[in-house]
Interface confidence: low
């Protein structure tokens, strides 16, 4: 009831909680001398659903037949009007729709670690709305039984709050839930366990690493655990990988021997416990223990390239490049390179050590054959040494990789091809790619890329260092013993028109020519390869169109003559640049005026 | 010199495709200029469109829109594709190059730029 109903009552027939579809009668009746003052034949009763009216009748009573109400609650409220007067509420009742409990299902029991209570959980299936009582029974040898309920309108787990204990670990429990509302009752089919069957171990705890004599080689994984574990498994990974390897081991009683961890390498190792063989459940996994391994000697040879550089008549530089070690080569933190130079007929031989860069320059005479060796070093030992003969990498013209292109594939990519020389190709015994930023001083510190291909390749695509609107001087090398032979091509990922022209720096004449000089484009304004320069020129003070002259880009070129300027006419000259996306804006406006003689 | 061959010409209907080529031999020309112009009976030689070694393109305004010129340095051929051709695109179309260096007034359609001439193609678009 929704009030103390003092002027009537509202009854319902056959019940306030109904099952889902049934059909209900409501009463509404007023208690003697409640109805309207002076006209009780005036007394209008008014049946609400919620807010909504459903029915009405003069009179003492009001009979209504409610069908088709939805799960869960539906409010009724009876309301008297009289004339000149507002409605009165007389009383009201709420109706309950639900079902039956279905029988819950999959019912299953479990103590965490040998110390724990028991606990069971079950599927309740579908949702009754209305109040149901659950009751979990379990019951063991010796006609023990323990009771436990639960109220809870969404009750799914209940803890018996004892311990079994692993006295008769094969002793069979019985455990049996039922729920119960005003509709009906159902109990689940009985579970049947051991204490073997529900006792999930707790997860291992205070696991340790050692590595003895600090080898990768002879690790061993150290733990706790409770004292009637059976089973472990361990999963280990490198920090950085998200798949795990996975070991079972029986008996291990606390301890195992790992033989597979790579060198100087973080892992993470994590074990789980079983009681029983075929029993039971695992464990959950301990917490994480995190370990880094001890360093090995490199594996692996270092990739090593070089240029020349003609100094004078007697000496040259050499410059060496080489490629970090790959983290599972290195195994280790490299502590240094050791490069070693040799004069492979005299037999003398130079040795550094090089700290903190992948590069090394030195001047040598021109006379004589050089080899060198270079090698990377950690804590525990050296790399095998790459051994590279010098030589002249373009010397042999019939070895030069033939109809070399770069082509822009996609973002800060470019795509190397070439033809095989035209010597005996079968010769090749590989192709080296080789690219740089193009800077017109031809700048030895620019940092230099390679990548290597095997002969029978035509194509390679570069990506490492390559920048969007930057030139490169790309270079294919075809290597056949001790000769090379090199083809070279400017390319770019990613172009548009240069931002500035040449600033025109100097103008003078020649035997009736004029000779145009000009600084280069800043590089970073350059906006890509630059394929041709534009000298332009018109009379000052003239209307008429400019003419032009076209001259293909030359990196160490910044000098032109023109020779059809008249004498005595003051011109006035620009220049501007071209990529393959289109042309510069003017670089600055310089005059002059011919003296010489007309032709 | 360099010597220029064009093909590709035909008949067509309006608002259908050709694609007219320029085959160039004696010598590599992708430094040089190359232009496409036309010719219809008593009328001068017409500017159609022109691509400089340094990859700039310029086009008639009859033809903007319409016509591409592009180049295979590769293959030293020049392409013209003609698109959405009208009755007036009829006439005999020549293919023209010139080295990239000259000295001369900048507006393309200027003949003298070009030393080199090939034959030209009949293009005829029917309505």
């Known amino acids: 009831k929704i009030d103390a109903c003092k002027r009537g009552d509202v009854t319902v027939k056959p019940s306030h909680v109904i099952l889902l579809g049934s059909t209900v009668n409501i009463t509404c009746s007023l208690k003697p001398r409640q109805g309207c003052f002076h006209y009780s034949r005036r007394n209008k009763l008014i049946l609400y659903k919620f807010d909504r009216r459903i029915n009405f009748h003069h009179g003492h009573s009001l009979n209504s037949q409610v069908t088709g109400l939805p799960l869960g609650t539906t409010l009724f409220v009876c309301k008297l009007a009289c004339i000149n007067s507002d409605e009165i509420q007389i009383c009201g009742a709420e109706i309950f729709v639900g079902v039956a409990p279905e029988q819950p299902q999959n019912l299953s029991c479990i103590q965490k670690g040998e110390q724990g209570t028991v606990a069971c959980t079950w599927e309740r299936g579908r949702d009754t709305h209305l109040y149901t009582e659950y009751t979990l029974q379990l019951s063991g040898p010796k006609n023990l039984t323990w009771q436990k309920q639960c109220k809870d309108i969404y009750c799914d787990y209940l803890d018996f709050g004892i311990n079994l204990t692993p006295e008769s670990p094969e002793s069979n429990f019985t455990a049996k839930v039922t729920a119960v509302n005003s509709l009906g009752s159902s109990s689940s089919l009985p579970s049947t366990f051991t204490f073997l069957d529900i006792v999930r171990p707790l997860p291992p705890w205070d696991i340790r690493i050692k590595f003895q004599k600090a080898s990768v080689s002879r690790c061993t994984l150290y733990w706790r655990d409770e004292g009637l574990v059976l089973l472990n498994r361990l999963r280990y990974r490198p920090s950085n990988s998200r798949l795990w390897n996975m070991v079972n081991v029986t008996k291990a009683k606390g301890r195992h021997d790992l033989l597979d961890l790579k060198p100087f390498t973080e892992y993470e190792f994590q074990i789980s416990s079983k009681l029983h063989l075929y029993k039971g459940s695992w464990s959950d996994w301990s917490e994480s223990l995190r370990a880094q391994t001890p360093e090995e000697e490199p594996t692996g040879m270092l990739d090593v390239w070089y240029m020349k550089r003609h100094i004078d008549y007697s000496r040259q530089q050499i410059s060496l490049f080489w490629k970090n070690l790959s983290v599972s080569e290195a195994r280790g933190k490299i502590l240094h390179y050791q490069v070693t130079l040799q004069e492979l007929t005299g037999g003398k031989a130079m040795t550094q050590n090089i700290t903190g860069h992948t590069s090394w320059t030195t001047v040598i005479p021109r006379t004589g054959n050089w080899a060198v060796a270079v090698s990377a070093a950690n804590s525990k030992g050296s790399s095998l040494p790459t051994r590279i003969n010098i030589m002249n990498l373009c010397e042999a013209g019939l070895l030069a990789p033939r109809q070399v292109s770069a082509n822009s594939e996609g973002m800060d990519n470019i795509l190397v091809t070439w033809q095989p020389p035209r010597k005996d190709p079968s010769a090749v015994q590989e192709y080296v790619v080789e690219w740089r930023e193009l800077h017109p001083g031809g700048d030895t510190q620019v940092p230099l890329n390679w990548l290597r291909s095997r002969p029978y390749n035509v194509s390679a695509l570069i990506s490492e260092n390559i920048k969007s609107y930057i030139c490169y001087e790309i270079r294919v090398y075809a290597l056949s013993g001790d000769q090379g032979g090199c083809s070279s091509i400017l390319g770019n990922s990613k172009h548009k028109a240069p931002l500035s022209g040449p600033h025109i720096n100097a103008i003078t004449e020649e035997k009736g020519s004029i000779l145009i000089s000009w600084n280069s484009i800043p590089v970073q304004e350059q906006m890509g390869c630059l394929l041709h320069y534009r000298i332009y020129w018109k009379e000052r003070d003239s209307n008429s169109q400019p003419q032009l002259c076209e001259i293909p880009y030359r990196v160490s070129q910044n000098s032109h003559p023109i020779n059809s300027l008249q004498p005595r006419v003051t011109y006035v000259l620009w220049m501007t640049a071209l990529t393959a996306a289109g042309e510069s804006s003017h670089g600055n406006e310089r005059e002059f005026c011919l003296q010489g003689k007309a032709n | 010199q360099v010597q220029l061959q064009e093909s590709g010409g035909g008949l067509v209907q309006a608002g259908g495709s050709l694609r007219l080529s320029c085959a160039a031999s004696?010598?590599?020309?992708?430094?040089?200029?190359m232009g496409w112009f036309r010719q219809t009976p008593g009328k001068e030689r017409e500017f159609v469109a022109a691509?400089?070694?340094?990859?700039?393109?310029y086009y008639a305004d009859s033809v903007k829109g319409r016509f591409t010129i592009s180049r295979d340095n590769v293959k030293n051929t020049m392409y013209l594709q003609m698109d959405s051709l009208k009755p007036e695109d009829t006439a005999v179309y020549y293919c023209?190059?010139?080295?990239?260096?000259?000295?001369?007034?900048?507006?393309?359609?200027?003949?003298?730029?070009?030393?080199?001439w090939g034959q030209g193609t009949q293009v005829t678009v029917s309505s």
């Open positions: 023209a190059a010139g080295p990239t260096y000259y000295s001369g007034p900048i507006n393309d359609n200027w003949e003298g730029r070009y030393d080199s």
């Open positions: 004696g010598r590599t020309v992708d430094s040089y200029a």
């Open positions: 691509s400089w070694g340094g990859g700039s393109t």
